[in-house]
Interface confidence: low
Amino acid sequence: VEIYTSRVLEAVNGTDARLKCTFSSFAPVGDALTVTWNFRPLDGGPEQFVFYYHIDPFQPMSGRFKDRVSWDGNPERYDASILLWKLQFDDNGTYTCQVKNPPDVDGVIGEIRLSVVHTVRFSEIHFL
């Protein structure tokens, strides 16, 4: 399995963000496919569970991401993305996407650095 994510994602405080994770695999996608998303806070705190998918999506029952995350992937299209709602500044950190698709060997875990910013996005600031 090979994982593809974009290196950095910016999103405005209070908005929703799609954490994109796609993958490739020599094995056909079937019921053995699992997707695990975790979160490492920017301040270096313990890793936290975000989301799990195996046949059906499993949302966290407690913690910071309860009622704030949903499945936005499509396994048949090799897409393991999730949607994170109502972003807060303390959502800043690294989100990891791990896809397992037996009998294919596990690949590198994909990482997305999420920066939650004020209403003005960097992409709207003139490059120096």
Epitope: Y4, S6, R7, E10, L42, D43, G44, V108, R113
Partner: antibody
Framework: QVQLQQPGAELVKPGASVKLSCKAS?????NYWMHWVKLRPGQGFEW???????????DYNEKFKRKATLTVDKSSSTAYMQLSSLTSEDSAVYYC?????????WGQGTTLTVSS | QIVLTQSPALMSASPGERVTLTCSAS?????MYWYQQKPGSSPKPWIY???NLASGVPARFSGSGSGTSYSLTISSMEAEDAATYYC?????????FGAGTKLELK
């Protein structure tokens, strides 16, 4: 207005160490990892490593693990890279940079010359 | 680590000519990033996540590709496009850059 300010040049003797600085302004310093990149004429860019300004956590290119040490001073929004045991191979332009979705912001680069 | 090979290393193009620069990866990568650099200046982000133009980049530029093969295309060469273009991958640690393609005006 995002700015990453670096000294223009440093001249250092072989065997010595040098600490390059990168002063950030115009954004929240702790929101973005600071990266360091090396450019040698005719040899292209090499990614050295990155540092999390919030807690000082680092991630290095294996090639530079024993050469470079990355630190930050949050109070002055400044990132530092110390290079040790300098040789002529370390003569290059060193850039600090932050990455965002659609734009990267780069300092002007510090030209390091290692010469006796 | 993933090696990015850019070709050609040096290219001359006339005004109005269509130009394609290629970047080949030693193994599959998810996305490619491109930079433009002119002498005495820092690199400028040019294309991000394979096909998206950075702020201020003229629409005559485009990016495409997947897997191990990526390209940057200029639909109609202009004098201001003369520069060195670098590709960069971020799919595998460490991030790596191509050696660059120097594009000159003929």
């Amino acid at each position: 207005q995002v700015q990453l300010q670096q000294p223009g040049a440093e001249l250092v003797k072989p065997g010595a160490s040098v600490k390059l600085s990168c002063k950030a302004s115009g954004y929240t310093f702790t929101n973005y990892w600071m990266h360091w990149v090396k450019l040698r004429p005719g040899q292209g860019f090499e990614w050295i490593g990155e540092i999390n300004p919030t807690n000082g956590g680092t991630d290095y290119n294996e090639k530079f693990k024993r050469k470079a040490t990355l630190t930050v001073d949050k109070s002055s929004s400044t990132a530092y890279m110390q290079l040790s045991s300098l040789t002529s191979e370390d003569s290059a332009v060193y850039y600090c940079t932050i990455y965002t979705t659609a734009l990267d912001y780069w300092g002007q680069g510090t030209t390091l010359t290692v010469s006796s | 680590q993933i090696v990015l090979t850019q070709s050609p290393a040096l290219m001359s193009a006339s005004p109005g000519e269509r130009v394609t620069l290629t970047c080949s990866a030693s193994s599959s990568v998810g996305y490619m990033y491109w930079y433009q650099q002119k002498p005495g200046s820092s690199p400028k982000p040019w294309i991000y996540v394979t096909s998206n133009l950075a702020s201020g980049v003229p629409a005559r530029f485009s990016g495409s590709g997947s897997g191990t093969s990526y390209s940057l295309t200029i639909s109609s060469m202009e004098a201001e496009d003369a520069a060195t273009y670098y590709c960069q991958q971020w799919s595998s640690n460490p991030p790596t850059f191509g050696a660059g393609t120097k594009l000159e005006l003929k």
